[in-house]
Interface confidence: low
């Protein structure tokens, strides 16, 4: 049977003064020689050699300093052996407990804690939970941590409370105000031995960001505003109104939303927020009329883009700020009413009769008075054919020259031009459009086609016809002797009711020829003017095609009327057409 004794040892100090720390003995000692052996952690397992035994006496000594945080308990396995090395007793497990000393300070899980909390949060709202651990013996004073706020920055009234045991940081009151302080730094100390003066401690920082809520109403910088703008003008920035809002800049809690509460009956104004400056930009989006409203009294309100925080929302009232707009009278100058005026040329007016033909009068009114404009000059504006003139004072419009009623400028029987009225005082100009209805040329005027073609010098004949839309056949053709002598050069002979052959009576030189032909119908009605048939005489090949390049793109035909090439606008208008060879 074992007889044993074991004392506890204390970590971190020289325990040799307590040796022997333990003693073992077997009662078999009385009748034989016994050798005592020990094994285990601290003996033959790391840390080696902490304990030694006197094999004869069974006294166990401790030889080195121990650390409870590494080995809180040593289990020593003891054996009693006879001279043959046989166990006389069942092996004994001897326990040597290491007593704790306060050699470890608390350690926070983070050296810096970051947290955030909305301003105006209720008292006792949890902000953050701090956590420190202590390596000393659990459930012992040496590891019992007490937390304490050492300092608050910015200083002043304490805003947070710290639960001494749980490490929970909570709001002390509901008076957190981001607009006063947006950040707090707490230094928190954790002390073991339940905060006793002899305890060990460590510290951490706790950085608390105060989050913005929309608890500040925007207000306008001024109590009233005024501006002036000329009538009939738009403005992308008439006034800038500055909103002041203490909430966090750049957020929807700060961003102003401007409202036109009254006075914008004509939807003349719009107001938009400049997100950079938070200013309201009052714009004029519809022209104002001094005669209609010389003064406009707007009232402007402002709220935020975000909803107001529940803690203040019921107190919000939209305070209207007056904005006085003075509309400046502008000499508005003349205007044509109506803006387009129609005139017509009487039937039968033609040729020289058109010259100085009075179409009528077109005058402007004074927009300021509504009466006919007095101090204005009239001039012709756009006039494609340069056919018109106008009396600069009366606005009477006349033709200034004869013109061809088949002109390309007359579209669907209408000639369009512009009249300008210039105010002598302001120089302001009004534009009016006139549409002149030009009656069509005699319906019975048969057109000869084609008007341009080539003929071959060796067979100088060409077939001419009136267009298929003409009626009043049979038609007769004759060469108009103008200039005198031209009729002697050309012969024209009808071949049927609508066609004739035009033949040169003399040898032609290569070049352009222009022959005036008058066509009469069966009622002896003729076109107002002779029609010019333009011919290009050239040497031809066997296919009646010109050998030179001068007639490229112009119809070439023999008297059968077969055509050989296309006509183009540019080539059809060759400008050096003469009365004889070029």
């Amino acid at each position: 049977e074992w007889i044993k004794f074991a004392a506890a040892c204390r970590e971190g100090e020289d325990n040799s003064k307590r040796n022997p720390i333990a003693k073992i003995r077997s009662d078999c000692e009385s009748n034989q020689k016994i050798t005592y052996r020990i094994s285990g952690v601290g003996i033959d397992r790391p840390p080696y050699g902490v304990f030694t035994i006197n094999p004869r006496t069974g006294e166990i000594n401790i030889t080195s300093v121990v650390d409870r945080e590494i080995t809180p308990l040593f289990l020593i396995y003891c054996r009693a052996l006879n001279s043959r090395g046989e166990d006389l007793e069942r092996p004994l497990e001897l326990r040597v407990k290491v007593m704790d000393i306060n050699d470890n300070a608390p350690v926070f899980s983070q050296s810096v804690y970051t947290a955030s909390i909305e301003e105006n949060s209720d008292a006792n709202t949890l902000v953050v939970k701090l956590c420190a651990t202590d390596a000393d013996e659990e459930n012992h004073l040496n590891s019992k941590i007490a937390y304490k706020i050492v300092s608050q920055e910015p200083s002043g009234a304490p805003m947070f409370i710290l639960n001494r045991y749980t490490g929970e940081v909570c709001t002390m009151s509901s008076f957190l105000d981001r607009e006063q302080h947006s950040m707090y730094n707490l230094v928190v100390r954790g002390s073991d031995r339940d905060g006793a003066a002899d305890g060990l401690s460590s510290e951490c920082d706790c950085r608390i960001k105060v989050l913005d809520v929309n608890d500040n109403f925007p207000t306008l910088e001024k109590t009233s505003y005024s501006a002036s703008i000329e009538e009939n003008c738009l403005s992308s920035e008439l006034i800038r109104l500055q909103a002041i809002d203490l909430d966090e800049e750049g957020t929807d809690n700060w961003l102003a939303q401007y409202l036109i509460l009254s006075g914008n009956d004509g939807n003349w104004f719009d107001i938009q927020t400049d997100p950079q400056t938070n200013e309201g930009i009052l714009k004029v989006v519809k022209m104002l009329d001094y005669e209609q409203a010389p003064n406009i009294q707007l009232s402007i309100g402002v709220k935020n883009q975000a909803d107001f925080h529940y803690s203040v929302a019921s107190q919000f009232q939209m305070h209207p700020t007056p904005v006085r707009i003075q509309v400046v009278d502008v000499r508005e100058g003349p205007a044509f009413h109506p803006s387009t005026m129609a005139f017509s040329v009487r039937e039968g007016i033609k040729g020289s009769s058109l010259l100085n033909y009075v179409l009528g009068t077109y005058t402007a009114i004074d927009l300021d008075t509504g009466n006919p404009a007095t101090d204005v000059r009239y001039i012709i504006g756009h006039d494609a054919g340069s056919w018109l003139k106008i009396d600069s004072r009366t606005g009477e419009i006349q033709f200034s020259r004869e013109f061809d009623k088949k002109s390309k400028y007359i579209i669907n029987g209408i000639y369009t031009a512009e009249i300008l009225a210039i105010d002598d005082g302001s120089g302001k100009t009004a534009t009016g459009t006139i549409c002149i209805e030009v009656p069509d040329i005699n319906d019975y005027c048969p057109n000869i086609f084609p008007e341009r073609r080539t003929i071959c010098i060796d067979s100088p004949s060409v077939l001419i016809s009136v267009n298929e839309h003409s009626y009043g056949s049979p038609f007769t053709f004759c060469v108009v002797d103008e200039p005198p002598g031209i009729a002697d050069m050309w012969d024209v002979r009808s071949t049927n009711a609508t066609s004739a052959i035009l033949t040169a009576k003399q040898v032609l030189s290569p070049g352009f020829y222009e022959i005036p032909i008058l066509v009469k119908d069966s009622y002896n009605r003729a076109c107002e003017l002779a029609q010019m048939v333009q011919l290009y005489a050239c040497d031809c090949d066997d296919n009646h095609m010109c050998l030179d390049s001068g007639a490229a793109g112009i119809y070439t035909e023999d008297i059968t009327g077969d055509t050989y090439g296309p006509v183009t606008e540019d080539q059809a208008g060759v400008s050096n057409v003469g009365l004889g060879p070029a």
Partner: antibody, heavy 128, light 107 residues
Framework: QVQLVQSGAEVRKPGASVRVSCKAS????????INWVRQATGQGLEWMGW????????AYAQKFQGRVTMTRNTSISTAYMELSSLRSEDTAVYYC?????????????????????WGQGTTVTVSS | ELQMTQSPSSLSASVGDRVTITCRAS??????LNWYQQKPGKAPKLLIY???SLQSGVPSRFSGSGSGTDFTLTISSLQPEDFATYYC?????????FGGGTKLEIK
Amino acid sequence: QVQLVQSGAEVRKPGASVRVSCKASGYTLTTYDINWVRQATGQGLEWMGWMNPTSGNTAYAQKFQGRVTMTRNTSISTAYMELSSLRSEDTAVYYCARGLFFGVVTKPNYYYYAMDVWGQGTTVTVSS
Amino acid sequence: ELQMTQSPSSLSASVGDRVTITCRASQSISSYLNWYQQKPGKAPKLLIYAASSLQSGVPSRFSGSGSGTDFTLTISSLQPEDFATYYCQQSYSTPRTFGGGTKLEIK
């Protein structure tokens, strides 16, 4: 009585645009916001954005940014929502809804936003 | 963007039953929550705003509760006209998101 009356059903081809109108009666259009919400067949409600009819200011859901335009004509008390570059998944019923702030009797310090009056809805079909 | 999650997505009940629908926000929204009722082919109708305030004209059998992230719509005694789809919606921030809806059907 207070009501919002919307324009009739529309059929559009992919890539086209549609404009839905919403006429307010029984109150002044400029007094309250107009929200637009859509609902695809058998699906839930999807908020598209709102417009302040007084200022014309708008806020659109990110999903519709660049494709939706909300406007108004206060003289005829009408709000409009135009959706462009239509695709088949835009087939839905589009609602306009009046948005306003509510005070709460039991909690005098509270101030909340909700949509209290809705239009009858406009069906928009996008199909090639 | 705030996510709103409703449960259950559908629910069968009988006339006279007490029914509860829940709505959860992905972050705290205080009491900025509305409930709407929608019947087939009709526009939604506002029932409750500010989590618990009953909209004018809505029967008192409807009630709302909750704050922060968890909210509840309760119908104390189901009536035939209450069979519809119910949606929650947050008004805390833009975009003003809706829950997926809860379809209440007759058992």
